[in-house]
């Protein structure tokens, strides 16, 4: 059916809109566009005759319309008046007419809004502030953002005036944030510049950072003072009661034991006139220098090289510590520490050994950490993978293959077809393939640093016809009530229908059967012994239909609870006892017997000649299936009576 799609549907003034025609009939004489919902000569915009390729403007033509040979209409420099319906009138070669109507709406581009405020310097826990979003605009939605997030839910925040006004009651220092308002209509959304609310408060009691009070000789002392305050506090430092400087930070390089003492920070708020102080006591100890790591091999090759990391400097009577990935060393036969723990050796490095590695020197107060060291392990390339996984393509399509191999440094790629080099790129593209493009496609990945190369070969067949399919399985011997089995119909080909049959019948409806991957994969969940049937897949495309050979599922099950036969439990003295045990199981189970708990023989049949009352007791048959790992058993009580003492007793075999 002929339809018109407006792209976009909501149009901004000054922009353009395309009235896109879908399902245009073939064999056309021409077509015309009209403003409105019907064909009206007075409102014709433009007409087009296919035979002459002539476009003729109509009364409603504004000079902003362009008609395309596919009948689509482009209207440029849109104005508000363009809103509404547009009708396409199509005249087919047989002079039968078709009509379709589309529409779009025009909206103005919104101006950038701004925020006005009724109080520029509110005081914490005292004042309220009202923000208003300007200008007031019809058909616009107003939104507010605090620190680029939508408004939090708070009883102190209130929206009014159609969301144009945001009021903050009883402001706190936490309301000191970036406020923006936004106006929206269907074609535009504009945000104001941010307005920062300036709440006056403080100063609070200052905090001195860092918190640690113990330092090494030779370190730099860098203390920072901060007190929450608006306007920002003015800071002063005192050491042992003596004024030092009026700065927020106190910096003393290369400190000595003499720099130990009490350090006072004073914060002052010029607006409130308040002062607050905090004192910290600093102790300076004589200490070793910061450690660092040296390596005997900065670019080791995976599975070939060992790396020895050494913690410097060497200091007598010092404890050395190591960390990998910010964790203590894992237990691994590939990680070796020297007697003094100063050297960490990684034997036969792998790509997972990159680190980071840190060493530390322990002293009486703390542990000094080295800077982290990362190993650049050279590896690969691994076997490249070629995607997509299709092996069959139909003539006329584009062939686009991508190759990837894990490698450090990244691999360099080459493509060969039937052994002939094509190009040195990661992707291979051949347009409009034919049968002649069938062949062996080789991706070669090369690692320039290790000098290693790996290749993957993919056979690609370009054919309208598909080959005989085959079924691959992810589990050849599934266990009953435990395993799932996924059958996949090979090969994977584009534009192909995949079908399945079980024992020559179409698939039964079952929650345990699931088709996926475009019906190419059939999964049986929680297999049962009844699933041990013949599975066939079929493939069908435009020119061919074919079926796989059947695959019979071998479900391992059991052993079920065994049965001992004969069922008799009473025997006469002197009879032969011949008990047979059977349990349903795949594969066949192993049998063993116990009499009164004492192991007997590992046979399916238990035979005792000329039994006596001494043979009374419990006879247990044990079955075990090594493939399923399951066991089962049954116990039978046997009573042997002295000859002739009781009627109805079995004479035995």
């Amino acid at each position: 059916k002929l339809t018109i799609e407006s792209t976009p549907f909501n149009v901004a003034e000054g922009k353009e809109v395309l009235l896109l025609v879908h399902n245009l009939p073939q064999h056309l004489f021409g077509y015309s566009w009209y403003k409105g919902e019907r064909v009206d000569g007075n409102r014709q915009i433009i007409g087009y005759v296919i035979g002459t390729q002539q476009a003729t403007p109509g009364p409603a033509y504004s000079g902003r319309e362009i008609i395309y040979p596919n009948a689509s209409l482009l209207i440029q420099n849109i104005i508000q008046n363009d809103t509404g319906f547009y009708t396409l009138h199509v005249i087919k070669s047989d002079l039968v007419n078709e009509e379709a109507t589309g529409q779009f709406r025009v909206y103005p581009e919104l101006p950038k809004p701004s925020i006005s405020s009724n109080n520029s310097k509110p005081v914490e826990d005292k004042d309220a502030v009202a923000f208003t979003c300007e200008p007031e605009t019809q058909d616009a939605t107003y939104l507010w953002w605090v620190n680029n997030q939508s408004l939090p839910v708070s009883p102190r925040l209130q929206l009014s005036n159609g969301n144009r006004t945001l009021t903050l009651f009883n402001v706190t220092r936490n309301d000191t944030a970036s406020y923006k308002c936004e106006t929206q209509n269907p074609v535009s959304a504009r945000r104001s510049d941010s307005v920062i609310l300036n709440v006056l408060y403080g100063p609070d009691a200052p905090t001195i950072s860092p918190l640690n009070t113990s330092y090494r000789s030779g370190e730099n002392l860098n203390l920072s003072c901060h007190a929450a305050s608006n306007p920002p506090a003015q800071y002063s430092w005192f050491v042992n009661g003596t004024f030092q400087q009026s700065t927020q930070e106190l910096f003393i390089p290369n400190i000595t034991v003499n720099n130990s003492g009490s350090y006072t920070c004073q914060a002052h708020n010029s607006d409130t006139g308040l002062n607050r102080t905090t004192v910290t006591t600093i102790t300076v100890y004589a200490e070793p220098p910061k450690p660092f790591i040296t390596s005997n091999n900065s670019n080791p090759v995976e599975d070939e090289d060992a790396v020895a990391l050494t913690c410097e400097p060497e200091i007598q009577n010092t404890t050395y510590l190591w960390w990998v990935n910010n964790q203590s060393l894992p237990v691994s036969p590939r990680l070796q520490l020297s007697n003094d723990n100063r050297t960490l050796t990684l034997l036969s490095v792998t790509r997972n050994d990159v680190g980071p590695y840190e060493c530390g020197i322990q002293n009486e107060l703390s542990v000094d950490h080295s800077d982290p060291v990362i190993l650049n392990v050279l590896y690969g390339p691994d076997d490249p993978t070629i995607s997509p996984s299709y092996t069959y393509y139909r003539p006329g399509v584009n062939l686009s293959l991508s190759c990837h191999a894990a490698s450090n440094p990244p691999a360099q790629y080459s493509w060969l077809i039937d052994g002939n080099i094509q190009q040195h790129t990661q992707e291979l593209f051949i347009s409009n393939i034919t049968e002649k493009n069938s062949g062996l496609y080789t991706c070669q990945a090369n690692n320039s640093a290790s000098g290693h190369s790996r290749t993957t070969v993919k056979t690609i067949t370009v054919s309208a016809e598909l080959p005989k399919p085959s079924i691959s399985s992810n589990n050849s011997k599934p266990v009953e009530d435990k395993d799932a089995v996924a059958f996949t119909c090979e090969p994977e080909a584009q534009n192909t229908t995949y079908l399945w049959w079980v024992n020559g019948q179409s698939l039964p409806v079952s929650p345990r059967l699931q088709l996926s991957n475009g019906n190419r994969t059939l999964t049986l969940f929680n297999v049962t012994r009844n699933d041990a049937r013949a599975y066939v897949c079929g493939i069908q495309n435009s020119v061919s239909a074919n079926r796989s050979d059947p695959v019979t599922l071998d479900v391992l099950y059991g052993p079920d609870t065994p049965i001992i036969s004969p069922p008799d439990s009473s025997y006469l003295s002197g009879a032969n006892l011949n008990l047979s045990c059977h349990s349903a199981s795949n594969p066949s189970p192993q049998y063993s017997w116990r009499i009164n708990g004492i192991p007997q023989q590992h046979t399916q049949v238990l035979f005792i000649a000329k039994i006596t009352p001494n043979n009374n007791g419990t006879y247990a048959c044990f079955v075990s299936n090594l493939a399923t790992g399951r066991n089962n058993s049954i116990v039978k009580s046997i009573t042997v009576s002295a000859s002739g003492t009781s009627p109805g007793l079995s004479a035995g075999a």
């Epitope: 309208a464 049959w501 495309n541 020119v543």
Partner: antibody
Framework: QVQLVQSGAEVKKPGASVKVSCKAS????????MHWVRQAPGQGLEWIGW????????EYDPKFQGRATMTADTSISTAYMELSRLRSDDTAVYYC?????????????WGQGTLVTVSS | EIVLTQSPDFQSVTPKEKVTITCSAS?????MHWFQQKPDQSPKLWIY???NLASGVPSRFSGSGSGTDYTLTINSLEAEDAATYYC?????????FGQGTKLEIK
């Protein structure tokens, strides 16, 4: 069971067009590609092309491209093959044909054929 | 396009005799398919994918071959086998048929 029933014989003049229909029953026409094959009197089989009734995709033998048009109306399970600008050597029996895996075995079904005679 | 050439064009054979029809393709194909057609009847798929007998086809028929050379064999001809046999390739567009081999019973 699966059946393909074609329209009756046609006699046409050179330059005219003919439209042969093929009504399917016993299966969903959308699930199978419909092929068209013709056979001139006393001659062999000649493939014309196929249509996918589900989406209207077609593939033609280049020698029929531009003259043959295959269409389908899935609502009435019918496929059509129209051949225009007929010539006397277009005189042939025209068959519709499907290749399907509706059973576990590939099956091939053919219409009974439509004889088109082109004569002045 | 791929040209299929059947040999022979015509063969007159006595019942119980073994019959071999060959089909040679101008370019290698994946499979060959064979059709049987009797006078005033539509063609019937006879052998699909080179060697698989279609439903209802007697076991005296067999198919073989690969690449460019394919064969249809009737082990012991029977009267009902009198017909024209066509090979067809579906590997490449356009699909093509051989010119046909007519079998006649002596």
């Amino acid at each position: 069971q699966v059946q393909l029933v074609q329209s009756g014989a046609e006699v046409k003049k050179p330059g005219a067009s003919v439209k042969v229909s093929c009504k399917a029953s016993g299966f969903n026409i959308k699930d199978n590609y419909m092929h068209w094959v013709r056979q001139a009197p006393g001659q062999g089989l000649e493939w014309i092309g196929w249509i996918d009734p589900e989406n209207g995709d077609t593939e033609y033998d280049p020698k029929f491209q531009g003259r043959a048009t295959m269409t389908a109306d899935t609502s009435i399970s019918t496929a059509y093959m129209e051949l225009s600008r007929l010539r006397s050597d277009d005189t042939a029996v025209y068959y519709c044909n499907i290749i399907t895996m509706a059973t576990p075995y590939p099956m091939d079904y053919w219409g009974q054929g439509t004889l088109v005679t082109v004569s002045s | 396009e791929i040209v299929l050439t059947q040999s022979p064009d015509f063969q007159s054979v006595t019942p119980k005799e073994k019959v071999t029809i060959t089909c040679s393709a101008s370019t290698s194909v994946i499979y060959m398919h064979w059709f049987q057609q009797k006078p005033d009847q539509s063609p019937k798929l006879w052998i699909y994918s080179t060697s698989n007998l279609a439903s209802g086809v007697p076991s005296r028929f067999s198919g073989s071959g690969s690449g460019t050379d394919y064969t249809l064999t009737i082990n012991s001809l029977e009267a009902e086998d009198a017909a024209t046999y066509y090979c067809q390739q579906r590997s490449s567009y356009p699909l093509t048929f051989g010119q046909g081999t007519k079998l006649e019973i002596k």
